[in-house]
Amino acid sequence: CKAMHVAQPAVVLASSRGIASFVCEYASPGKATEVRVTVLRQADSQVTEVCAATYMMGNELTFLDDSICTGTSSGNQVNLTIQGLRAMDTGLYICKVELMYPPPYYLGIGNGTQIYVIDPEPCPDSDF
């Protein structure tokens, strides 16, 4: 297992609809054809696999069937979007990238993106 650098933004604010997007960029030392990306949430004394996708370079990301994530890839960048977030989902979201094929296997783990989620205020009753 060889180490690889992964970069991601330090902070992201989710939209009022509970959607957060960020870019995960990895410094590929070679020409990987199969890449696996996993997003981990670390907060509240929990470590959760939020979503995971395996993709062939140049193809769409295929997330596992339970996924609340969508994403696209472009070169060594993965654009990730997490949907349906609630205020309690605020936490550190870590991007883990594995270059699965061809050998050698590379593993990179980012420093994490702190995602802040604010539940929308209910609309006040209107007289109109």
């Epitope: 596992l64 339970d66 309690m88």
Partner: nanobody, 126 residues
Framework: EVQLVESGGGLVQAGGSLSLSCAAS????????MAWFRQTPGKEREFVAA????????SYADSLKGRFTISRDNAKNTVSLQMNNLKPEDTAVYYC???????????????????WGQGTQVTVSS
């Protein structure tokens, strides 16, 4: 209505292992998010581990990751918790819980789970 029945609890010495099992009935099991929680007298239920509908995604309490492993068998309608290197502080009643909404969540809370088993006692002696 989903019903959950836990089994596998008991008395074990520190450093030992136990495997808990939870059998579900009454609904399509593969559409349910499952979890294990535990509770000691006078304390709130504490999250242990959770697993997504297909079993492809998991969540663990930070302090337990590496010792405990959650898994599920959708063909047999069961979810299991393998507990290794048990410590006296793992002594608790362990509850199986189901979220029939089935949506995977980054943060796991007891309030997300509407169906609970009766619990199984795990006692770890020193």
């Amino acid at each position: 209505e989903v019903q959950l029945v836990e089994s596998g609890g008991g008395l074990v010495q520190a450093g030992g292992s136990l495997s808990l099992s939870c059998a579900a009935s009454g609904r399509t099991f593969s559409s349910i998010t499952m979890a294990w929680f535990r509770q000691t007298p006078g304390k709130e239920r504490e999250f242990v581990a959770a697993i997504s509908r297909s079993g492809s995604l998991t969540s663990y309490a930070d302090s337990l990751k590496g010792r405990f492993t959650i898994s599920r068998d959708n063909a047999k309608n069961t979810v299991s918790l393998q507990m290794n290197n048990l410590k006296p502080e793992d002594t608790a009643v362990y509850y199986c819980a189901a979220d029939t909404n089935g949506r995977w969540r980054p943060a796991i809370r007891p309030s997300d789970f509407e169906i609970w088993g009766q619990g199984t006692q795990v006692t770890v002696s020193s």
